[in-house]
């Protein structure tokens, strides 16, 4: 035991990766604990993270239950139990979030590519519909559910022999694009939400090339 | 400053119940946490129970779903159920208010033998 002062929470950031949301902050508490509200701008305060000595909580249970809402969390600082206080008495020392709104700042993760079908000259190449935390009628709703045609695909595809890429838009999860007959392909995607000003795109899916297992091929 | 007054500690045999209460002096914010911590002879300051405003809790590991801690935010107030007791449950009992520091009740006596 001792006694100290309590600081006040710094550099509150959120991480949030289709909608699994995070808020993480500084410093590491030394003779301190910490609790975390969250609130939409006409809600109450919830308590999140109660008496922890993390720095960071996760929040998902909470943005989920309505992502187009605009949420603010604080981050309260609390003397420890086994701290004998030196400071001024009154209300306990808080950090305001940044105001953070899922549907439109949540990272889109990294797509992956399910499958590709060739049928003589076309290709039909089918991306993984990625199951979110956001619940409705007790069902995980996929990213398609939730963002509907705000969320377009684009596609990179190029001939394994030479490095021109071509791409395709799509915004649905499949594509059905031309390719030269006899000839190997590598594709890629990437995740975009065109109307977004922020995050709108999300890194490339790993590269799946014809001739490897995932795809199908054929002959017509 | 906020004066934090103990009541309900005594005498139990093991097994047995007691119910402590604690009330400010004067109005507790919902931004604080309150809650009960404990001393034993010869060991250190260890949490019971803490509460918030809106009534999330937290209790110490030896806690083991024996007591509940409950708060009255219009009274400012706080309270602890214990149940189950044991001799190893002895102790003076300390009500806490955390804001922006500690405030500290004077103990109440909680003494479990047979």
């Known amino acids: 035991s001792g006694t100290t002062n309590t600081v006040a929470a710094y550099n509150l950031t959120w991480k949030s990766t289709n909608f699994k949301t995070i808020l993480e902050w500084e410093p590491k508490p030394v003779n301190q604990v910490y609790t975390v509200q969250i609130s939409t701008k006409s809600g109450d305060w919830k308590s999140k993270c109660f008496y922890t000595t993390d720095t960071e909580c996760d929040l998902t249970d909470e943005i989920v239950k309505d992502v187009k809402q605009t949420y603010l969390a604080r981050v309260f600082s609390y003397p420890a139990g086994n701290v004998e206080s030196t400071g001024s008495a009154g209300e306990p020392l808080y950090e305001n979030s940044p105001e953070f709104t899922p549907y439109l700042e949540t990272n889109l993760g990294q797509p992956t590519i399910q499958s590709f079908e060739q049928v003589g000259t076309k290709v039909n190449v089918t991306v993984e519909d990625e199951r979110t935390l956001v619940r409705r009628n007790n069902t995980f709703l996929s990213l398609r559910d939730v963002f509907g045609k705000d969320l377009i695909y684009t596609l990179y595809y190029w001939k394994s022999s030479s490095s021109g890429k071509k791409t395709a838009k799509t915004n649905t999860n499949e594509f059905l694009i031309d390719v030269d007959k006899g000839e190997n392909y590598c594709f890629s995607v990437q995740a975009v939400i065109p109307s977004r000003t922020v995050n709108r795109k999300s890194t490339d899916s790993p590269v799946e090339c014809m001739g490897q297992e995932k795809g199908e091929f054929r002959e017509i | 400053a906020v004066q934090l007054v103990e009541s309900g500690g005594g005498l139990v045999q093991p097994g047995g119940s007691l119910s402590l209460s604690c009330a400010a002096s004067e109005m507790i914010s919902s931004t604080y946490i309150m809650g009960w911590y404990r001393r034993s002879p010869g060991k250190e300051r260890e949490l019971v129970a803490v509460i918030s405003g809106d009534g999330v809790t937290h209790y110490g590991d030896f806690v083991k779903g024996r007591f509940a801690i409950s708060r009255d935010n219009v009274k400012n107030a706080v309270y602890l159920k214990m149940n189950f007791l044991t001799p190893e449950d002895t102790a003076v009992y300390y009500c806490?208010?955390?804001?922006?520091?500690?405030?500290w009740g004077q103990g109440t006596q909680v003494t479990v033998s047979s």
């Open positions: 806490n208010a955390a804001g922006r520091r500690n405030h």
